[in-house]
Interface confidence: low
Amino acid sequence: DFGLDCDEHSTESRCCRYPLTVDFEAFGWDWIIAPKRYKANYCSGECEFVFLQKYPHTHLVHQANPRGSAGPCCTPTKMSPINMLYFNGKEQIIYGKIPAMVVDRCGCS
Amino acid sequence: DFGLDCDEHSTESRCCRYPLTVDFEAFGWDWIIAPKRYKANYCSGECEFVFLQKYPHTHLVHQANPRGSAGPCCTPTKMSPINMLYFNGKEQIIYGKIPAMVVDRCGCS
């Protein structure tokens, strides 16, 4: 698998992974003890036909072109977890691995 | 996890899974021996804020609202394989499980 990496200076218009630091304090998410911020990344850009398509299914739907099907969109195709210390709903402190918090790769699906 | 199922008569505008039969013969994909057609399904519809969001990451990016980030889009969140008989690039006949050929669930990511 392959995905483009960009930054805020990139002129790339196609589907790409951009850096993004999420700051929980800035959001007022005070129920998260640690980390207070982390590198989440995000996906943005255009999905031209066949570019970075993760699944053969995406190509097939494009071929079949059913009513109402949008073109593929730029979305995470590989994500990874982070470990977090946080309060659950019972005010207990939990240490756990939270899935799909970091975008490792972007693609068109 | 939860996802909506719709059909061509549905009035649902939100992100939904729709039925779609892919016909390889109609595409001229003569390198696929079997099946000649299969139920692939596809995703279509609007992703209002928080509706059917698969990952907490999607919500966080929406909060952070970086330059160029589009809203979440309606995309497969669960897919399954099908068994296929097909030619590889060396004209050999292969029987194999091809991943991510069927959309089982749609969501916003």
Partner: antibody, heavy 124, light 107 residues
Framework: QVQLVQSGAEVKKPGASVKVSCKAS????????MHWVRQAPGQGLEWMGN????????NYNQRFKARVTMTTDTSTSTAYMELRSLRSDDTAVYYC?????????????????WGQGTLVTVSS | DIQMTQSPSSLSASVRDRVTITCKAS??????LSWFQQKPGKAPKSLIY???RLVDGVPSKFSGSGSGTDFTLTISSLQPEDFATYYC?????????FGQGTKLEIK
């Protein structure tokens, strides 16, 4: 070496049928799609359809679908193209061509070997 | 069906000239285009596939370019054996369709 040898020229009356053969040698006949293309005198090339000898599955150009049948005989490594209800505008050279598949996508192929062609003349 | 339009339909050139033939598809065919050479009374011969890849054994004076809807075949230095008719073919979808041909003649 890989070779496709076609049957000889035919003269047919309008309304008749013709069956052109294409004998393959030098490769595994069942593993490659065989296509048929025709060319009217002084005209361009027109794709008629194809057949996969491994299982006999064929795809036809809609223009010929009602009149054409493509078959294979794997025991003799021969492909056949039968065209029925012949008209004068079916007068053409009919070619078989082997599809060579080089990639992994649906259109990753090209015609690498052609038969010498069979002239079919339709005249009353 | 996808229409393939070749231009020019005929072309006069001299030995050692550089010539370009174009082929236009009525819709996007990605890079799924082949070029053929045909001499009178002979079967077509494949030159280029996937728009720009040279078939084994074909001299490098032949080159192809383009993607989407617009494609070109270039012969860099014409030799007497290159005077023939050239066809493009789209193999992006069935039915396969050919261009109407370009007849390359000696000036």
């Amino acid at each position: 070496q890989v070779q496709l040898v076609q049957s000889g020229a035919e003269v047919k009356k309008p309304g008749a049928s013709v069956k052109v053969s294409c004998k393959a040698s030098g490769y595994s006949f069942t593993g490659y799609f065989m296509h048929w293309v025709r060319q009217a005198p002084g005209q361009g090339l027109e794709w008629m359809g194809n057949i996969y000898p491994y299982n006999g599955v064929s795809n036809y150009n809609q223009r010929f679908k009602a009149r054409v049948t493509m078959t294979t005989d794997t025991s003799t490594s021969t492909a056949y193209m039968e065209l029925r209800s012949l008209r004068s505008d079916d007068t053409a050279v009919y070619y078989c061509a082997r599809r060579y598949y080089y990639g992994t996508g649906p259109a990753d192929w090209y015609f690498d070997v052609w038969g010498q062609g069979t002239l079919v003349t339709v005249s009353s | 069906d996808i229409q393939m339009t070749q231009s020019p339909s005929s072309l006069s050139a001299s030995v050692r000239d550089r010539v370009t033939i174009t082929c236009k598809a009525s819709q996007d065919i990605n890079s799924y285009l082949s070029w053929f050479q045909q001499k009178p009374g002979k079967a077509p011969k494949s030159l280029i596939y996937r728009a720009n890849r040279l078939v084994d054994g074909v001299p490098s004076k032949f080159s192809g370019s383009g993607s989407g809807t617009d494609f070109t075949l270039t012969i860099s230095s014409l030799q007497p054996e290159d005077f023939a008719t050239y066809y493009c073919l789209q193999c992006d979808e069935f039915p396969l369709t050919f261009g109407q041909g370009t007849k390359l003649e000696i000036k």
